[in-house]
Interface confidence: low
Amino acid sequence: SPGQGTQSENSCTRFPGNLPHMLRDLRDAFSRVKTFFQMKDQLDNILLKESLLEDFKGYLGCQALSEMIQFYLEEVMPQAENHDPDIKEHVNSLGENLKTLRLRLRRCHRFLPCENKSKAVEQVKNAFSKLQEKGVYKAMSEFDIFINYIEAYMTMKIRN
Amino acid sequence: SPGQGTQSENSCTRFPGNLPHMLRDLRDAFSRVKTFFQMKDQLDNILLKESLLEDFKGYLGCQALSEMIQFYLEEVMPQAENHDPDIKEHVNSLGENLKTLRLRLRRCHRFLPCENKSKAVEQVKNAFSKLQEKGVYKAMSEFDIFINYIEAYMTMKIRN
């Protein structure tokens, strides 16, 4: 409905500003159970490997993130709550914070780009066609911008 | 074939180091025709808008980049070559440099992530299952890493 659309847009506007607070809430909630679990974790191998971060930053990022949130909420935390009555409440609180994050993500398509279709290239081609012969001069004269964009893309890929 | 696999891996290993040189070659080639086209471009509006850069950095980045390279090679440059015999050779040279870049991209799947399927979340779940009860301690003790990964994802989305 239009109402939902507006809500979505508002969430998008507010979201970046809320991000540090939401992450701080997650970290605060985790700090209450961190020692308990890290003391019990005697394994030297790593579960959340760099490959997961790479996927988060890659083209399947939002799907990977959504799936990982679901994994923690539906598989890990229910089991974690049963380990000690003292930490059940804190694990539950951590889960609520994670659910809040997921709710915000769902409301804002900018943070779930896998549900969107890109239009930028299409817009370039349409504008180029409308300019007719002048479009060639325009596209060629802006080739240095294109190189800059390629560089930005490649740099991102190297860093990620 | 194994040969192609090796070639792909070698390209991946060498590519980041080659990137500045390849971009320099592109810029050098463009510098020979830049003045010609920029003098002829009398239009004040911009063709390659910021939205294109955003798409390059987004989840459809490699598709957008591939399409833009194709657009320049198949639509813009063939027309540009016909504008003046003096610059035909230089435009051709620019096109060759762009083709080289595309070839390198195609050889290295890291730079064409849209052609890959992610396995990271699946690997996490498999490892978690194998660890049985210890998996809960491991997954919960690494929740701070998960928050870092969420933060990296969100920060990338905000920046892009």
Partner: antibody, heavy 119, light 106 residues
Framework: EVQLVESGGGLVRPGGSLRLSCTAS????????MAWVRQSPDKGLEWVAS????????YYRDSVRGRFTISRNNAKTTLYLQMDSLRSEDTATFYC????????????WGQGVMVTVSS | DIQMTQSPSLLSASVGDRVTLNCKTS??????LAWYQQKLREPPKLLIF???PLQAGIPSRFSGSGSGTDFTLTITSLQPEDVATYFC????????FGPGTKLELK
């Protein structure tokens, strides 16, 4: 117990080459990304190069790119740093380190190996 | 590159003192910061990661705090074996290290 043991350091003339090795034990080597970090009195601690756990990708600081090559042999649980065209400013103690990924801290360091570049 | 500064560069304190070391970064790194202790002729040893969690086996007198650009390492009751140089390390964008704070006994 996690152990990282470097070897291959020494005195070399400017323009010369050295190959550092780092033998890892006490953990699953192929589960970790590895890096070389160097330390000198004038420049302090400087990250030099990193390599992903499966050796697919390598990363270098600008001042060594093209001169240094990081590699690894997971079967031998060994990390390498081939250093060519050495300069006096490369003089430092080189540490082998392990890390979970490129947005994650360096958790264990070897004892270090001294590299001196001097004529 | 992200630049890092540490203060003070030299700190003299007595056994039992509460000691505070500071680290500042040139841009927001959220909580992607680690602290290392380096004793003479030894490699750096990880104390703190992600700004505050304590590495396994590190005494609880060490603690870390901060986020964004300003971080603190605190030693609640200084012990003779804590004499060392302390480095901060950001891993938010690439890897850079602070110049270090040398901690000595009065």
């Amino acid at each position: 117990e996690v152990q990282l043991v470097e070897s291959g350091g020494g005195l070399v003339r400017p323009g010369g080459s050295l190959r550092l090795s780092c033998t890892a034990s006490g953990f699953t080597f192929s589960d970790y990304h590895m890096a070389w970090v160097r330390q000198s009195p004038d420049k302090g601690l400087e990250w030099v190069a990193s390599i992903t756990l499966d050796a697919t990708y390598t990363y270098y600081r600008d001042s060594v790119r093209g001169r240094f090559t990081i590699s690894r042999n997971n079967a031998k649980t060994t990390l390498y740093l081939q250093m060519d065209s050495l300069r006096s400013e490369d003089t430092a103690t080189f540490y082998c380190t392990r890390h979970r990924g490129f947005s994650v801290w360096l958790d264990y360091w070897g004892q270090g190996v001294m590299v001196t570049v001097s004529s | 590159d992200i630049q890092m500064t540490q203060s003070p560069s030299l700190l003299s304190a007595s056994v039992g003192d509460r000691v505070t070391l500071n680290c500042k970064t040139s841009q927001n790194i959220f909580e992607n910061l680690a602290w290392y202790q380096q004793k003479l002729r030894e490699p750096p040893k990880l104390l703190i990661f992600n700004a505050s969690p304590l590495q396994a086996g590190i005494p609880s007198r060490f603690s870390g705090s901060g986020s964004g650009t300003d971080f603190t390492l605190t030693i609640t009751s200084l012990q003779p074996e804590d004499v060392a140089t302390y480095f901060c390390h950001q891993y938010y964008s690439g890897y850079t290290f602070g110049p270090g704070t040398k901690l000595e006994l009065k």
